[in-house]
Structures are given as C-alpha cells and as structure tokens.
C-alpha cells in the first residue's frame, strides 16, 4: 500500500476490476465448487457444534468397592502343609490411593515372623557362593535385601549364599500363585461418583441422577448410565481374562467421557463409560510384567519387633475424565464463517488453472493440432488475452521495431553490443488491434482532406517500385531514404534502422505518413487539444511539434501505449520528421528511454 | 540365547604357549561378562579369567601374571593368551557368559561360576614333556 501524502489519500477504497466469462462450462463448474463447499461447511458447523464455545471438563471422582472373597492358603507348619481358609473384606483387599484411582488385590505372597538379624541370602545366580572371595562386607545389590558381611554360608544343604544383615528369613523368590488366591475379586463391584463442573458456561453435574436405581449393574448397551462396574465385566469390555491378569496383576482405565451441549434447545450431558488396558500386557518377564508392590504388618514379639511381608499382585484402575461442555458463542460462528470464506475462492483458482493451462504454449503447438475433441479449448486463448495484461519489465535495454513489410512486432530486449539494430532479430510480438475510436480524436481536417490534384481517391498503397538506394544511405537501409546517425560511435546502432526489413518503398512516401505524422495542423491540433492555451515561440514550438510527431508515429505503427513508448523510430521516419520540424542548432539527443 | 564354542586346545611342552579362543553369537554379545573356567579330571570347576562388558578383568589365583584374557567385540570373540604354562595346568577349558544388561556383574563376583548362565562344551588342553 502506497505511503499516504495527504487526508484524501485516506479517505480512498480500492478494488479489483473482473472479467466476467459467460461460459456454461466454467459457470457449472463455480456453482459445482460452491454447492460442494457451502455443503461442507453447514455440515461441518452442525456435526462439529462449530459454533459453540467449548471448555474442558473439570472433575472429582470418589469410589467404593465392595465384595467378599473367600481365600484357602496354603501354609507350612512344621515341616507340614496346611490348607487355612480365610475370608477377606474391601478392608483387607483395598489400599488407600491417591488421585482418581482404586486399587484391588488379587492375589499375594507372604513372608511371615521375619526380623532383624544376620542369615544367608535366598540362592540366586547373584547371592550363591563357593568361598568369602564371592561376598564383599558392606555390600548392597540393588536387586538384594539386605548388607553383605563378607562371608559365604550355608544356605540348605550344599548351597551355599553370601551371609546379609537383613529382616529374616529372607523373602523367597518364587512365582505368584496360580490360580490368583483371590480369584474371586472378578464378581466384586465399584460405584464410581464423579462430579463434574465448566466454570466457564457456570455448569456442575454429576453422573448419578436423583432418580437413580443403586441396584444396577452398568452394561455397554442394556443399562450405559449405570455408575456401578463389576470388575469382571470391566475385563471382558476390553477382550481380556479376568483370572489371567489377577495372577500378576495390572492396570486398568476406566474412562468417562462428558460431551456436552448445554444450549438451552438441544441440551445433553451425561456420561459415556469405556475402559482400556493401560499396563503392557506382553512384557517380557524379566522387566517386571502386572502390577505388585509390597507392605508389611508390623508386631512385637516377646519383645521383638518382627513383620509379615507381604507382596501384593493386583489390578490398579484409573479413573480418566475427560470430554467439554459447548455453549452457543457468535464470535465463534463469526470467527468459523470467516476462515471458511477463503474455501469459496477455489472455484476461482481452479478456473483460472485450467484457463492459464489450456492457453499455454504447449497446448497450442502439441496438443492442439493433433487432437480434435481439445480444439473447443482453444476458446481459453480468448479468455486469457481478456483476463490478462502481458507486461515486459522496462529494462534499459527494452526497444520495440515495427518493419512496415512485416504483420507483427519485434521486442529487443538486449544490448546492441554494435551491431545494427536492423539486424537484431528480436522476439515476435503480435501487433495490438487498433483502437479506431482513437481517430474520431483528430481534426476534421484528417477525415476529409481534399484529393491531391493528380492522384485518384481510393487508398494509397505504397508505391510498389522500389525507391532507388541513394548513394549516401548506409549498408542496412532498405528503402533508400536513411541517413547515417549522428549520435558518438557508442550510440550509433540505436539509429541504425529502417522502416522495412526487406528492400521496397519508404514509408514516409505514405500518403498516411504526410497526414498523421507531418501534418502541421494535425499535430497542432493535437498540441491544444492537451493543452487549450498553448501559445509558443517558433524554436520551442518546431520542438514540440517534432517529438509530438515522434509520438504520432509511434502510435500510429506500434498501436499499444507501452509499445509506443519503447518504440525505435526508423532513421527515414526521424530524419524526415526533423526536416519539417528542424531544430536551429545543435545535435538531435536521438531515443532516451523513458523509465 | 548366546551359543559360546571354544577353540585352540592341544598338547603344549611345559613353558610353551597356547591362545585359545571363545566364539559368541549372538547381537548382544557386548552386554556380557565373559569368563574362562577349566576343570582337571577328578576336581571341581576352577575359575581362571574372566571379563566384563565395560572390560574389568579378574584372574584366578594359580594363573595370575601368566594368562591374559580380552575381548573382540567386532568379532564376537574372547581370547585367553596362556604363556608359561605348566602340567598342573592339564584340563577342559570352559567359557561362560554372564548377562549384564539389567546390571553388571560386581567385580568381586567375576570368578562365581554360578554369576554364568551360558557355557560351552570345552576344549581340552594338555600339557605335558
């Protein structure tokens, strides 16, 4: 945007200037693009609740398990196994957690009446020795229990193990118990509450409704608003075995999804329950598969404080809110509208791909000529010489000829480097049509001229006899009426052109050439036409009627106004323009460009 | 799994030399300890040089400054140089590999047969005039 000068300046609008094609096939092709969009766009504002405002759920959950299982340990006693039955209640079973999860064991091992004092490691690849050299006083492995002493005892029998400070016996390294010793912890059940809030939209719910029957049982299809789970249902919602997972243990989601729409018209918000698996369910043994940790139940004991290890393998739910709350908002249906209204540009740019596609060189000179049902195409010619102006950077070096025997233009964009601008090739550039509406701007005079005695009416033609070659016109003169330039030797190719490019008849022998270009009444008239009051001394006025005759000239033959503009005057053209309209001293300055 | 082969036993004159070499497979072979163990007819197993995967080297007792133990990780080998050797060092060589990739092997450690999960099936060694 250009700078502003002045208080008008901002006070000004701008818009762009279209060409409207009537086409049925670009026509449908626009409203197929819009129909397609505007679809979108409605669907896409409904389905997505675009229009609403919508904030994230901020939630609390409070939980309560309950069940009873049954459990039948099995115990040594003196060397004997005994088989103990033992009932355990969701105070046995459940572990206080924090954050919004629950924890429910299934199974366990037990290390009972272990206290502090020295004794020989449980044998394993690490504890096992055959002299002290294996044990290292002080000592402490990170996968051991207790502080090495240094020495190498016996553990049972011929094994021998490294003697640690430790609580004692030592914990076995053994397997949990298959099936899970709480097995039964399939058919306990979880009644989740969970409270839920958009302090944005000032809304708070929760998932159990007044009216609720706390009898039920959530199921997927048959009862979705149930708040109450039972564990083993949880298990097969996610494709797994309840009794497997009990054995090592795992964690398990329990998601509650809240999408809300609390617009007065279409109001809905309750939860929606789904569950994952979260722990890795094929990890390798030796990176810890399930789920287990360990506490211990501390007692005296004759005055000695002992413990009852005890390494619980369970299943840890999480409970994952989630979801938003949308309320109608207009600036974001205005803020939606506007980012879609760009969508509706595409018709335009796909439009225009196929007009630039069609019109391409290409086109014209492979696809054209050889393929019949693509000639209806070629009406993209047409449409793109509308919709585009063509213009040429104006470098120092741009010059346009026009050679009365040839039908187009040359465009010479490149330095001379002294060779004669008669024998520059160029690049072919077709001839702008004329404006006739330009000539109702002459005088009179020019439309009906008097015939001159001698010479019948009709169009004069060029003369068709070659004009003899002077002997002073130079080398590249093909109409015999060129002068050499008197422009430095640096310059002198410039000039060096003719007004044919083949040899033949001058144009300034042009009956058109006296009226339009030579003509003093015309070219004073066009002079007052610019400027009404003009009143001239005659050097300043012969000045200005020579380069406005350089200007009628140029276009008269290069009919463009950025043509005539870079246009190169044959050297006949200028020397007999400058012999009716003569400068009274000094040298003529020859073609400056104009940028 | 890492399959262990031993190589280079043979008959040796007392104060001669002999390299015997372990060759591992396997692509985790650098997350080993290695260690050469021997057992003479009639005895225990003995330990005599082992090597862990960041390349700390322990030596049995009877065979320090006389055997040398290293490792080629490029080409998954393990050769112990035995120079001076005498005829109480008559017996089946063993290599064994101890996997550190969960922890290393503590150094003290190194000579306990039972640190070594994989064993090879040995090549003899005799010495003998």
């Known amino acids: 945007m250009p700078a502003c000068c002045s208080c008008s300046d901002v006070f000004q609008y701008e818009t762009n200037k279209v060409t409207r094609i009537q086409s049925m096939n670009y026509g449908t092709i626009k409203w197929f693009f819009h129909v397609i969009i505007f679809s979108y766009v409605c669907f896409a504002l409904v389905s997505d609740k675009l229009y609403q405002r919508k904030e994230p759920v901020i939630s609390s959950v409070h939980t309560k398990v309950k069940g009873i299982a049954e459990v039948k340990e099995e115990i040594v006693e003196n060397g004997v196994k005994k088989l103990v039955h033992s009932v355990f209640d969701t105070a046995d079973y459940t572990f206080p957690l924090q954050g919004n999860s629950f924890f429910v064991m299934t199974n366990f091992l037990k290390t009972e009446g272990q206290e502090q004092r020295l004794c020989p490691e449980y044998p394993t690849r690490r504890t096992l020795c055959s002299s002290d050299r294996g044990c290292k006083k002080g000592w402490m492995d990170p996968q051991s229990k207790g502080i090495q002493t240094g020495r190498c005892v016996v553990y049972e029998g011929n094994q021998k193990t490294c003697e640690v400070s430790a609580w004692c016996p030592i914990e076995a390294v053994e397997e949990a118990p298959r099936p899970a010793l709480l097995n039964s912890a399939e058919n306990f059940t979880v009644l989740i509450k969970n409270n839920i809030d958009f302090p944005g939209h000032n809304y708070t719910t929760r998932n159990i409704l007044p009216g609720l029957n706390i009898t039920c049982t959530f199921h997927k299809t048959q009862n979705p608003q149930c708040p109450i789970f039972r564990l083993g249902d949880i298990f097969r919602e996610t494709g797994d075995n309840f009794s497997d997972v009990a054995i090592q243990g795992g964690i398990m989601g329990i998601e509650i999804y809240w999408d809300c729409n609390l617009d007065r018209w279409f109001h809905h918000c309750r939860p929606k329950y789904s569950f994952r698996r979260l722990d890795d369910k094929t990890t390798n043994v030796s990176l810890y598969p399930g789920y287990n940790f360990r506490y211990a139940k501390y007692y005296k004991e004759n005055n000695v404080e002992k413990r009852t290890l005890i390494k619980v393998f369970g299943i840890r739910f999480d409970i994952l809110v989630f979801g938003t709350g949308g309320k109608f908002d207009i600036i974001q249906l205005v803020v939606y509208i506007g980012s879609t209204l760009s969508y509706f540009g595409l018709a335009a740019v796909f439009i225009d791909f196929l007009i630039d596609t069609y019109s391409s060189n290409c086109c014209r000179s492979h696809i054209y000529p050889w393929c019949k049902c693509c000639q209806p195409c070629v009406v993209n010619e047409y449409y793109y010489r509308k919709k585009c102006e063509s213009i040429v950077e104006p470098k120092p070096t741009l010059k346009y000829v026009s050679f009365v025997d040839e039908s187009h233009i040359r465009m010479v964009n490149q330095q001379l480097l002294g060779r004669s601008l008669q024998d520059v090739k160029g690049q072919e550039v077709p001839r702008p049509a004329m404006d006739f509406t330009d000539l109702s701007r002459l005088p009179l005079a020019l439309h009906d001229t008097p015939p001159i005695p001698g010479q019948p009416e009709e169009i004069q033609l060029l003369r068709k006899e070659a004009t003899p070659r002077s002997r002073d016109s130079p080398v590249w003169c093909q109409c015999g009426s060129c002068l050499p330039s008197q422009l430095p030797e640096s310059h002198r190719c410039l000039e060096e052109l003719c007004c044919r490019k083949k040899p033949g008849a001058c144009i300034t022998t042009s009956e058109l050439f006296r009226k339009l270009v030579l003509s003093r009444h015309v070219l004073q008239f066009l002079l007052l036409y610019q400027e009404p009051l003009l009143a001239l001394d005659v050097d300043s006025t012969n000045s200005r009627l020579r380069h406005c005759a350089y200007r009628c000239y140029a276009t008269w033959r290069f009919g463009s106004q950025d043509m005539a503009d870079f246009a190169i005057l044959p050297s006949c053209c200028r020397w007999r323009i400058r012999k009716e309209f003569p400068k009274s001293e000094g040298q003529y300055s020859g073609f400056k460009s104009p940028y | 799994e890492v399959q262990l082969v031993e190589s280079g036993g043979g008959v040796v004159q007392p104060g001669g030399s002999l390299r015997l070499s372990c060759a591992a497979s396997?692509?985790?072979?650098?997350?080993?300890?290695m260690g050469w163990f021997r057992q003479a007819p009639g005895k225990e197993r003995e330990f005599v040089a082992a090597?862990?995967?960041?390349?700390?080297?322990d030596y049995g007792d009877s065979v320090k400054g006389r055997f040398t133990i290293s490792r080629d990780d490029a080409k998954n080998t393990v050769p112990l140089q035995m120079n001076s050797l005498k005829p109480e060092d008559t017996a089946l060589y063993y290599c064994?590999?101890?996997?550190?990739?969960?922890?290393?092997?503590?150094?003290?450690?190194?000579?306990?047969?039972?640190?070594?999960?994989?064993w090879g099936q040995g090549t003899l060694v005799t010495v003998s005039s």
């Open positions: 064994a590999a101890a996997d550190e990739t969960l922890g290393a092997v503590p150094n003290f450690r190194l000579h306990e047969k039972y640190e070594y999960e994989y």
């Open positions: 396997g692509r985790t072979f650098r997350h080993y300890a």
């Open positions: 090597i862990s995967s960041y390349g700390s080297t």
